[in-house]
Interface confidence: medium
């Protein structure tokens, strides 16, 4: 499945999901980690406020569901969901899917390599029982918890590397960049928004190179 | 492009010990996991084991514990598989394969035929 | 158990569609991921993850999954596609990888 194929429009876009807005735009409150984004966004201020939340309305999500998960760990699912939310500049990579609950998702967006690194390194030592984040839960209390016969491990047990956490976890929607931070070539989930958003230039690049690819991807293969 | 380039062919005697390397280029090696993969011939896929090439840690399948050791050379952006006590049901094609998640095997090394005969 | 198992043979006409299938208990909470194999030939991911294709692969090639079996369907199945094709999938418990069995297939005319 090529990431792009569906869509023509592959800049300042924003994805037909569950809670994103329909056109990007200024949004001045966005809050804390989702603040990078707030000069140009596809959430809303009340989206940034509630997905900092454990177990936050957007998604029944728990993120404690084999104990409280370290801070330090947390802060990188919680910078996953700001970009997953807000970005605009994810076009090149968004596929049409057939899900009751959203009509596309990513795949394939080439996270910087650091930024996956740090994730992981920042998370080896909170527990989850699954590898796999986007199914195989048991839903029937309203909430995600652990499927009968999943042990509650440490996340090297059920991610035993890097690429296994940020390739893995929510099905190949990121895949690991060989490009650093910075160069252009990946998207930064952590950035300074002083300096602007470094992801624009990044969208740029892989929009263009699909245009003269006539659609077919430059990089090679493999989200949310 | 990322590549995988194994070792040659070896022939070993009952009883011997053999060591397939795989180089990697292309990408990050200490990212990623890698696999090994044998298949005799005419027979099926057969999963080995694997290296986290970060921290070298390792996990074999049940079949091959005590007889298969899997290291890596970071440096030199290599893995190697070393399988011990050889005897002829070992013959078949040994492949290292690179894991994207969990299982996931994207790149593949060209094989190493390993025949092991007295 | 953490067994694959997987129907040995497979044959489908000339441009026809054709599903193989592979089964097991560790698919009710792992996706798996096929790759097709030809004689004296490393094995070549087609499909993984959730119905994800690698690029190069044609889109004649799908994936999809129900409770503990996954399956690989080819649309309009060309002669090229003639090749082994394995499943595999992640045991949860104690991080290990299973191959199924392998399909033979062959395509007819």
């Known amino acids: 499945a090529d990431p792009g194929q569906d869509r023509t429009d592959l800049l300042n876009v924003c994805m037909d999901a569950k809670h994103h807005k329909t056109k990007p735009g200024p949004e001045d409150k966005l809050h804390d980690q989702c603040s990078p984004w707030k000069k140009n966004a596809c959430c809303t201020a009340s989206t940034s406020q509630e997905l900092h939340k454990d177990t936050s309305r957007l998604y029944n999500f728990n993120w404690d569901h084999c104990g409280k998960m370290e801070p330090a760990c947390k802060r990188h699912f919680i910078q996953d969901t700001c970009l997953y939310e807000c970005s605009p500049n994810l076009g090149p990579w968004i596929q049409q899917v057939n899900q009751s609950w959203r009509k596309e998702r990513f795949l394939d967006v080439p996270l910087c390599k650091e930024d996956c690194q740090r994730w992981w390194e920042d998370c080896h030592t909170s527990h989850t029982c699954k590898s796999n984040w986007h199914r195989g839960w048991d839903w029937t209390s309203g909430v995600n918890k652990c499927p009968a016969g999943a042990l509650c491990r440490t996340f090297e047990s059920y991610f035993p590397t890097p690429a296994a956490l940020c390739e893995g976890l929510w099905s190949h929607s990121y895949k690991v960049s060989n490009y650093s931070r910075g160069s252009g070539r990946c998207i930064q989930m952590w950035f300074d928004s002083a300096q602007g958003n470094p992801n624009e230039e990044v969208a740029r690049f892989y929009a263009a190179a699909m245009h003269v690819n006539a659609g077919e991807m430059l990089h090679h293969h493999h989200h949310h | 492009e990322v590549q995988l380039v194994q070792s040659g062919a070896e022939v070993k005697k009952p009883g011997a010990s053999v060591k397939v390397s795989c180089k990697a280029s292309g990408y990050t090696f200490t990212i990623y996991a890698m696999h090994w993969v044998r298949q005799a011939p005419g027979q099926r896929l057969e999963w080995m084991g694997w290296i986290n090439a970060g921290n070298g840690f390792t996990k074999y399948s049940q079949k091959f514990q005590g007889r298969v050791t899997i290291t890596r050379d970071t440096s030199a952006s290599t893995a190697y598989m070393e399988l011990s006590s050889l005897r002829s049901e070992d013959t078949a094609v040994y492949y290292c394969a690179r894991d994207i998640s969990y299982g996931s095997f994207d790149y593949w090394g060209q094989g190493t035929l390993v025949t092991v005969s007295s | 158990s953490s067994e694959l198992t997987q129907d040995p043979a497979v044959s489908v006409a000339l441009g026809q569609t054709v599903r193989i299938t592979c089964q097991g208990d560790?698919?009710?909470?792992?996706?798996a991921n096929w790759y097709q194999q030809k004689p004296g030939q490393a094995p070549v991911l087609v499909i993984y993850g959730q119905n994800n294709r690698p690029s190069g692969i044609p889109d004649r090639f799908s994936g999809s999954s129900s409770g503990n079996t996954a399956s690989l369907t080819i649309t309009g199945a060309q002669a090229a596609d003639e090749a082994d094709y394995y499943c595999d999938s992640r045991v949860s418990t104690g991080n290990h990888v299973v191959f199924g069995g392998g399909t033979k297939l062959t395509v007819l005319g």
């Open positions: 560790s698919l009710r909470s792992n996706y």
